[in-house]
């Protein structure tokens, strides 16, 4: 089975790599534009140069292309806590990231928000904070994990999942209360 190709892929596949079919004359293969440039005019004939122009400020192309316009540079989402790691150039989009000791939480494939890495107070670091994952904490005895923070078992209500983790503590408290002097 031949995989389905879009019209542009079909047109490009007839020409050698780095070239594309002239949209008005399918007997002509024009050279693609280098990254950082875009297609201003198709080549007038075989062996003649494609008219490529450099992207204007605020736009880019990251690979060889025959785009009629450069792509707009991405903007880092300040409301998501993002910071600019590297600014946009004619051949590379803006790179956004998080500050030191923060991780990315993805809301969708391309949208992330920055959050501070957990410090594991009242616990130990099981896995260090990574670019796309918070620290994984293991809590000390008498504490349970809630929203990746170690919370005292004294805050464990019967209805919460912590009852299993805090059960020995709860029983110990009951035990000391029950073993009053007579």
């Amino acid at each position: 089975l031949v995989p389905h190709l879009g019209d542009r892929e079909k047109r490009d596949s007839v020409c050698p790599q780095g070239k594309y079919i002239h949209p008005q004359n399918n007997s002509i293969c024009c050279t693609k534009c280098h990254k950082g440039t875009y297609l201003y005019n198709d080549c007038p004939g075989p062996g003649q140069d494609t008219d490529c122009r450099e992207c204007e400020s605020g736009s880019f192309t990251a690979s060889e292309n025959h785009l009629r316009h450069c792509l707009s540079c991405s903007k880092c989402r300040k409301e998501m806590g993002q910071v600019e790691i590297s600014s946009c150039t004619v051949d590379r989009d803006t790179v956004c990231g998080c500050r030191k000791n923060q991780y990315r939480h993805y809301w969708s494939e391309n949208l992330f928000q920055c959050f501070n890495c957990s410090l594991c107070l009242n616990g130990t670091v099981h896995l260090s904070c990574q670019e796309k994952q918070n620290t994984v904490c293991t809590c000390h005895a008498g504490f349970f994990l809630r929203e990746n923070e170690c919370v005292s078992c004294s805050n464990c209500k019967k209805s919460l999942e912590c009852t299993k983790l805090c059960l020995p503590q709860i029983e110990n408290v009951k035990g000391t209360e029950d073993s009053g002097t007579t």
Epitope: W107, S108, E109, L111, Q113, S118, N134, R146, E147
Partner: nanobody, 117 residues
Framework: EVQLLESGGGLVQPGGSLRLSCAAS????????MLWVRQAPGKGLEWVSG????????YYADSVKGRFTISRDNSKNTLYLQMNSLRAEDTAVYYC??????????WGQGTLVTVSS
Amino acid sequence: EVQLLESGGGLVQPGGSLRLSCAASGFTFEEYNMLWVRQAPGKGLEWVSGIGPSGRETYYADSVKGRFTISRDNSKNTLYLQMNSLRAEDTAVYYCAKGSITLFDYWGQGTLVTVSS
């Protein structure tokens, strides 16, 4: 089959409060981001708030920051939205939505919140 059932909407006076709930089923609730989105009369969808699988990560639109609080109870497969200091501009149908790589892929039938005196 993914099912999301919102409740808790109604008519409330400006400055009042409401708590919306969303009962989820048909997927592993604790593994997904969950969101609240709303649609005001004659307007498009607006992402109001989101919460990560553990409940630690939260997002609020600027328009609701400091007034709304999102929370979840993974043991009950339920998402909540506590709405305080409600304004006329909060009038909308509120939808609970399951997170996905495209932000969300399933949402409920919605619950109407009307803020009016």
